[in-house]
Interface confidence: low
Amino acid sequence: EEELQVIQPDKSVLVAAGETATLRCTATSLIPVGPIQWFRGAGPGRELIYNQKEGHFPRVTTVSDLTKRNNMDFSIRIGNITPADAGTYYCVKFRKGSPDDVEFKSGAGTELSVRAKPSAPVVSGPAARATPQHTVSFTCESHGFSPRDITLKWFKNGNELSDFQTNVDPVGESVSYSIHSTAKVVLTREDVHSQVICEVAHVTLQGDPLRGTANLSETIRVPPTLEVTQQPVRAENQVNVTCQVRKFYPQRLQLTWLENGNVSRTETASTVTENKDGTYNWMSWLLVNVSAHRDDVKLTCQVEHDGQPAVSKSHDLKVSAHPKEQGSNTAAENTGSNERNIY
């Protein structure tokens, strides 16, 4: 009679994470008598996966009934596969011995590869806000996928970005992999509503890529433009001066009025109006009693936006003559930078 052979017909098996792997093994003879064991890996460090004779292996079931006398099918199923299960599995026939069974013959081995989905991409932006025209970096990370082949794309508002660098780790063989990508994005004043999207495509995702997003509203700072204008007089000796703070983001803003360098009033932006592009406008006004000043008055609107160094705009108020009525120009209509003396 021909000597027993252990046949593992599958060189490799590819299974999705969470599914069941079937590892096939057939013996060509019933002789010699003895149990079958399954191992992952070869050599002294191999890991016992299943022992026909004894032990408890909750994730492993046999394909056929190994208690039947004439059974020669030693295939097993391993449930709830994870990337950690990847490796080469050997079906090994033992010959009954005393006191211990002796290894008789091994199958050629079946390589189990696990297809694992990448984790949802996490996109993170810079720690500090940046202003328009500056280039900022965004990172995207996804982990735990297998096989290694993966595609990552960056988009800004649906437009694909080209300035990015991607690494997949580790470089060598591994049970699972991670991807890390850094994209450079140039900010514009219109980016408050913009989104940066990292898209990951992998064989396990069946054509539905995973996406991670970052809102540029978390990243951008649009500094305000200031305009100080003088409004028509309210009374014989009172002048109303407005400071228009336009197109700023985020909302955090503090405004201080200075009269000849002395603090007159400080206030925080509250009832702002929002522009279509997501930036804000705000207006503050100061009622100046001209009769209280003997000399010309320098009015300064000083704005501290989002913790940045203050910016200011000044307006000279001459008190040497009575103020004239201005035209019908309202603050909203006066779009130029009006620093003219109107006396």
Epitope: D10, V203, L205
Partner: antibody, heavy 119, light 103 residues
Framework: DVQLVESGGGVVRPGESLRLSCEAS????????MTWVRQAPGEGLEWVST????????YYADSVKGRFTISRDNSKNSLYLQMNSLRADDTAIYYC????????????WGLGTLVTVSS | ALTQPASVSANLGGTVEITCSGG????YGWYQQKSPGSAPVTLI????NRPSNIPSRFSGSTSGSTTTLTITGVQAEDEAVYYC?????????FGAGTTLTVL
């Protein structure tokens, strides 16, 4: 770069056999389904056969079922098509194609090999 | 079977749409063949995915059982036969091909 190179084409008589090969490089061959597509002279593309990544499942067009056998050797990064009982209407250029996720989509194609069946 | 028009024409720089319908595919692909016997080139796979070497003027969309290949800014080199592909009860199928003529 992904490359698929077919070979094994030639002129045979009706009823004879031929074995086509496709050598793959530039990607992890064992992770992808592979397909044979053919194009008869003056005709459109016709799907012939597909094999799963592990090689344990094969699909065939009705026109070749029982005559053609698709196989692969992942250790050699190679795909094969054993064609038996060849007929005149099997005359075509045979392309090897790499499938992408679902086996009915192909993202890379070989240049093809011509099979002529003529008496 | 997948049904697509036998031929379409487009002006240089214009936009052209080629539709494909039928079969019971959930997803489709589009393939370009510039001359009979030359290797097909994948333009779109799985409805909307474009290989990295394919220009962005080619795009795909699918609604129900109809898939559409759109070429915006048609170039002279786009003159070719375009095949749609899908699956039907386990079999791979192709449309008969649409010849694009650039005017």
């Amino acid at each position: 770069d992904v490359q698929l190179v077919e070979s094994g084409g030639g002129v045979v008589r009706p009823g004879e056999s031929l074995r086509l090969s496709c050598e793959a490089s530039g990607f992890t061959f064992r992770n992808y389904y592979m397909t044979w597509v053919r194009q008869a002279p003056g005709e459109g593309l016709e799907w012939v056969s597909t094999i799963s990544d592990t090689g344990d499942t094969a699909y065939y067009a009705d026109s070749v079922k029982g005559r053609f056998t698709i196989s692969r050797d992942n250790s050699k990064n190679s795909l094969y098509l054993q064609m038996n009982s060849l007929r005149a209407d099997d005359t075509a250029i045979y392309y090897c194609a790499k499938s992408w996720i679902w086996w009915t989509f192909f993202d890379y194609w070989g240049l093809g090999t011509l099979v002529t069946v003529s008496s | 079977a997948l049904t697509q028009p036998a031929s379409v024409s487009a002006n240089l720089g214009g936009t052209v749409e080629i539709t494909c319908s039928g079969g019971n595919s959930n997803h489709y692909g589009w393939y370009q063949q510039k001359s009979p016997g030359s290797a097909p080139v994948t333009l779109i796979y799985a409805d909307t995915n474009r290989p990295s070497n394919i220009p962005s003027r080619f795009s795909g969309s699918t609604s129900g059982s109809t898939t559409t290949l759109t070429i915006t800014g048609v170039q002279a080199e786009d003159e070719a036969v375009y095949y749609c592909g899908g699956s039907s009860t386990g079999d791979g199928i192709f449309g008969a091909g649409t010849t694009l003529t650039v005017l």
